[in-house]
Amino acid sequence: SGTTNTVAAYNLTWKSTNFKTILEWEPKPVNQVYTVQISTKSGDWKSKCFYTTDTECDLTDEIVKDVKQTYLARVFSYPAGNVESTGSAGEPLYENSPEFTPYLETNLGQPTIQSFEQVGTKVNVTVEDERTLVRRNNTFLSLRDVFGKDLIYTLYYWKSSSSGKKTAKTNTNEFLIDVDKGENYCFSVQAVIPSRTVNRKSTDSPVECMGQEKGEFREI
């Protein structure tokens, strides 16, 4: 149902990385505008992005209130310039989004190697603990704060002079690996949430190599 000059939104899609969460939909509006509502399964509807001509709405502020909740959004279509107009059923045309549980579904952003330090034949590689928009006690939480031990990192490393890679894993943000003295190594990391069945892994971090600025070398 709905007025003759509005069409319902479709292809409602959640785009979420490290809890930054945007709802996208189609079509590009022609003589119509949209309003989005979001709710938890048991909560009240909250309106966002009022009468917008955009086809996306940033819902981060709502979902970060409880990232373990399951959310549902809906997109209402109104005739441009006549937003009080309703459909034949007495309410505006709308379409529901798929359900979205941020903790289980947000994509893991590409990690960054913060630093590496060589001490003799050991290298300590540290992964940057990225800040999220999830807040607790007025402080932004890091990815590790949110996921705890549910988040692990996989390190790929290899001698600059060869192609054979090795791997290690950690449930902190640090790796301590053995290396051959006098060899330069390159590193890349990947974030993983083993308990998930989808969106389990991030893309690989940019490669960082010894002998470049980011690291520190100490001969002991």
Epitope: I152, Y156, K165, T167, K169, T170, P194, T197, K201
Partner: antibody, heavy 117, light 107 residues
Framework: QVQLVQSGGGVVQPGRLLRLSCKAS????????MHWVRQAPGKGLEWIGL????????IYDPKFQGRFSISADTSKNTAFLQMDSLRPEDTAVYYC??????????WGQGTPVTVSS | DIQMTQSPSSLSASVGDRVTITCKAS??????LNWYQQKPWKAPKTLIY???SLADGVPSRFSGSGSGTDYTFTISSLQPEDIATYYC?????????FGQGTKLEIT
């Protein structure tokens, strides 16, 4: 449900090559690491290597590096183990396994490879 | 590379007995240790992961303990269906390495 179905084993002459397949169903291999493990007759388990099918990263036990090659075709949801210059001591049952990053949670049924002239 | 030394290589026990198998790593593996059960002509099955966690669907008579380099696998009350070979596996860093296996028999 999750399944790994292996194929490609058999009897092969020394020096030849063989490619084993591990066809996954019930999940997308891009979301997991895929491993190959072998077991010679009457012996223990031996880890060969792994692949991250999403980016093609491969890691091998150094003793298999060069002669064995792991690959994946995400469009076919299948992982492969190619073994070159096969030797009699490569005779074993070869298993593929899915790694959820905690443990190998699903295994293929195993495929026997016999290297003999 | 990390070496895993598993003992004993075989053991015989009676139904109801408490059975213990150990694995010693050549360096700290930070609890990245799993225990697998393998029955003849079958693929291995995970019993314990991250040294102490019970895998889904595994009976509670199986348990694991340990940290650093020393790990223990225990069957609190041996059942006839537990006849199998048991392996530890370290997966903290590559190459992943299995223990040599422990063949468990019932007397």
């Amino acid at each position: 449900q999750v399944q790994l179905v292996q194929s490609g084993g058999g009897v092969v002459q020394p020096g030849r090559l063989l490619r084993l397949s591990c066809k996954a169903s019930g999940f997308n291999i891009k979301d997991y690491y895929m491993h190959w493990v072998r077991q010679a007759p009457g012996k223990g388990l031996e880890w060969i290597g792994l692949i991250d099918p999403e980016n093609g990263n491969t890691i091998y036990d150094p003793k298999f590096q060069g002669r064995f090659s792991i690959s994946a075709d995400t469009s076919k949801n299948t992982a492969f183990l190619q073994m070159d210059s096969l030797r009699p001591e490569d005779t074993a049952v070869y298993y593929c396994a899915r790694d959820n990053s905690y443990y190998f949670d699903y295994w293929g049924q195993g495929t026997p490879v016999t290297v003999s002239s | 590379d990390i070496q895993m030394t598993q003992s004993p290589s075989s053991l015989s026990a009676s139904v109801g007995d408490r059975v213990t198998i150990t694995c010693k790593a050549s360096q700290d593996i930070r609890k990245y240790l799993n225990w697998y059960q393998q029955k003849p002509w079958k693929a291995p099955k995970t019993l314990i992961y991250y040294a102490t966690s019970l895998a889904d669907g595994v009976p509670s008579r199986f348990s694991g303990s340990g940290s650093g380099t020393d790990y223990t696998f225990t069957i609190s009350s041996l059942q006839p269906e537990d006849i199998a070979t048991y392996y530890c596996l370290q997966h903290g860093e590559s190459p992943y390495t299995f223990g040599q296996g422990t063949k468990l028999e019932i007397t």
